[in-house]
């Protein structure tokens, strides 16, 4: 994306097709891709699984991964709702965003810090990312303490979402 | 929105007007709608009210609701700042996002878990949603513990915001 | 940005160039500006500094500030990861978003509320804003307790990001 200094005397998208309207139009940032997936009902490993019957447009879902189909700059956001039965020690909740199996960003929060065995403690954790992604890039989420993600009480609260901000034609 | 496999040999927005430029242009995702509202000064019920003199464009505000005027995929985000005078027991803060009066997503966090009556405890809670919304859809926010939203000390911190990501013409 | 009532009988962007395609096209909201910066390794003051080798497009970075180059409606989001060695009293973590050296929005959270000197407590804090910004507007972040931002353990976790949602030509 090149950003014009003036909308009146330069082509909108580089190159030399400033008067060729179809050319300009086809190179304009019209593409839209997005996803909004809720966590799967039954979690059994640290890599979270998602309900593939969520919102998916221009993105694929496969084996716990969102798979990019169109290159560009994506806004990625994940939000998780935890319910912790406090043990006698504090608990560190961690949310990892992985791009192509590499940790790209993580968020941590400590709960049960008083060391008291309370009935339960709620905690909400979010993580976002703005990044260029290529075709076939995978996005996944890792939670070491996945047993604290209460998918039965909060089936709608644990989500992974992305949208394409700017395509890279 | 259909996403072309190649920007060079397909129309940008479906149909059969690929060489009819005005047709293509008018079907392109140009529409923009957004809102950014701060919480009202005086809260007296669990359904939050908002200052209608905030940013509103292509969205209406009525009786605590944002009302959609253009159909499409919206990004919705709410952030609340709590100030809790800790009682002797823990307090669960909850933020509910409602679409057409139905709970679509909620976030919960427990504060004052130590059971100690401290002077005050700050907590910040966010919630987001990416969803298709039709014309006249209402968006509202419910907070059971609205008395802990300190609108006087933090008048700017409690906000509800949306923007249209992709219109559905 | 004016939002058309019907995509079939009005120009997309006001004025009277509805059949003049190049005119329409050049006034369409194509501009894209964005930034995604990670916090600098060594922090020595409350105003945070950022790694200028992050993602910057249509935005400048200077002396701890993001500087707007194109006017419009921006989505701004900051996320910080704290690691606190609890003292004997509670700690209020605060994140301030400043626009042109004025406080625009803040987020606060209290940690170490039990008053116990635990080994460490993790906390994650986010803040967002949707606002119209003019050319040369500065965006900065202030954290009074910057010593708790652990840039060595979490070099990727502390970020300031913006994107232009709608330009105001």
């Amino acid at each position: 994306d090149s950003i014009p200094n003036s909308p009146d005397n330069v082509p909108l998208k580089g190159g030399d097709c400033s008067e060729d309207l179809l050319c300009i139009l086809k190179r304009a940032p019209f593409k839209k891709s997005w996803a909004y997936l809720q966590v799967a009902k039954h979690l059994d490993k640290t890599k979270l699984s998602w309900n593939k019957d969520g919102i998916l447009h221009g993105v694929r879902y496969q084996d716990g991964n969102l798979v990019i189909q169109f290159p560009g700059l994506y806004f990625i956001i994940c939000q998780l709702q935890f319910l912790v039965q406090c043990p006698q020690n504090s608990v560190d909740l961690k949310l990892e965003l992985l791009i192509n199996k590499h940790i790209k960003k993580q968020a941590l929060v400590t709960v049960c810090e008083s060391g008291m065995q309370t009935k339960h403690v709620y905690q909400n954790l979010s993580q976002f990312l703005l990044d260029y992604l290529q075709v076939d890039t995978t996005i996944s989420v890792n939670v070491d303490t996945f047993q604290y993600i209460d998918t039965s009480t909060f089936p709608l609260e644990n989500v992974l979402s992305i949208f394409l901000y700017s395509n890279s034609d | 929105d259909s996403i072309p496999n190649s920007p060079d040999n397909v129309p940008l927005k479906g149909g059969d007007c690929s060489e009819d430029l005005l047709c293509i242009l008018k079907r392109a995702p140009f529409k923009k709608s957004w809102a950014y509202l701060q919480v009202a000064k005086h809260l007296d019920k669990t359904k939050l009210s908002w200052n209608k003199d905030g940013i509103l464009h292509g969205v209406r505000y009525q009786d605590g609701n944002l009302v959609i005027q253009f159909p499409g995929l919206y990004f919705i985000i709410c952030q609340l700042q709590f100030l809790v005078q800790c009682p002797q027991n823990s307090v669960d803060l909850k933020l509910e996002l409602l679409i057409n009066k139905h709970i679509k997503k909620q976030a919960l966090v427990t504060v004052c878990e130590s059971g100690m009556q401290t002077k005050h405890v700050y907590q910040n809670l966010s919630q987001f949603l990416l969803d298709y919304l039709q014309v006249d859809t209402t968006i509202s926010v419910n907070v059971d513990t609205f008395q802990y939203i300190d609108t006087s000390t933090f008048p700017l911190e409690n906000v509800l915001s949306i923007f249209l990501y992709s219109n559905s013409d | 940005d004016s939002i058309p009532n019907s995509p079939d009988n009005v120009p997309l962007k006001g004025g009277d160039c509805s059949e003049d395609l190049l005119c329409i096209l050049k006034r369409a909201p194509f501009k894209k500006s964005w930034a995604y910066l990670q916090v600098a390794k060594h922090l020595d003051k409350t105003k945070l500094s950022w790694n200028k080798d992050g993602i910057l497009h249509g935005v400048r970075y200077q002396d701890g500030n993001l500087v707007i180059q194109f006017p419009g409606l921006y989505f701004i989001i900051c996320q910080l990861q704290f690691l606190v060695q609890c003292p004997q009293n509670s700690v209020d973590l605060k994140l301030e978003l400043l626009i042109n050296k004025h406080i625009k929005k803040q987020a606060l959270v209290t940690v170490c509320e039990s008053g116990m000197q635990t080994k460490h407590v993790y906390q994650n804090l986010s803040q967002f804003l949707l606002d119209y910004l003019q050319v040369d507007t500065t965006i900065s972040v202030n954290v009074d307790t910057f010593q708790y931002i652990d840039t060595s353990t979490f070099p990727l976790e502390n970020v300031l990001s913006i994107f232009l949602y709608s330009n105001s030509d």
Epitope: - | S152, T153, F154 | T46, K47, L98, N100, K101, N142, D144
Partner: antibody, heavy 124, light 110 residues
Framework: QVQLQESGPGLVKPSETLSLTCTVS????????WTWIRQPAGKGLEWIGR???????NYNPSLKSRVTMSVDTSKNQFSLKLSSVTAADTAVYYC??????????????????WGQGTTVTVSS | QSALTQPASVSGSPGQSITISCTGT?????????VSWYQQHPDRAPKLIIF???NRPSGVSYRFSGSNSGNTASLTISGLQAEDEADYYC??????????FGGGTKLTVL
Amino acid sequence: QVQLQESGPGLVKPSETLSLTCTVSGGSISSYYWTWIRQPAGKGLEWIGRIYTSGITNYNPSLKSRVTMSVDTSKNQFSLKLSSVTAADTAVYYCARERVVGASRYYYYGVDVWGQGTTVTVSS
Amino acid sequence: QSALTQPASVSGSPGQSITISCTGTSSDIGLYDYVSWYQQHPDRAPKLIIFEVNNRPSGVSYRFSGSNSGNTASLTISGLQAEDEADYYCSSYTSSSTWVFGGGTKLTVL
């Protein structure tokens, strides 16, 4: 027109607690920060701290361990307690109003209303 | 928090302009545009004359103006008059949600 009046003992013994009250008349105590500022004889102003009607306080770091402020909205009063005083705490103590408005951003209008000040001497 | 730095005294003749500087740090004046100035006559309570760097409360003469650059704020008094003789204090909001004052400047009108 809002007026502020400080009250409290003019003499306090070392190691004891200094207690002052400020009464707000002619206006509401709500929606403002209420501040204490002191000035030793012949010296400059020192900001002690402030309290909002919600009970939130901010204190000068150098005095924080000794300062407590409170507000009583029903009486339109706010108060200052300074513990373990020494001769260095001898000063004229002013109560004052700070106006902060949150609109499109936070506007800080400064300390716009002051009491006339009360002299406190710390001596045995 | 350290006090802001002001010159102990300045002087000027009637009709002249004088400027009083106030130097802080990157955690107060350098961070926010929340600088206030106060005028204090002998045995009187201070009076607010400038807020948010360069704004005057109603009733304050246009001859008072403020500015801010980097970690330093300035108060300028133009068309100096005898009644301007007083002590002047700057104050800045700080990153810890507190305020800090300058040491004060005695203005003498010659």
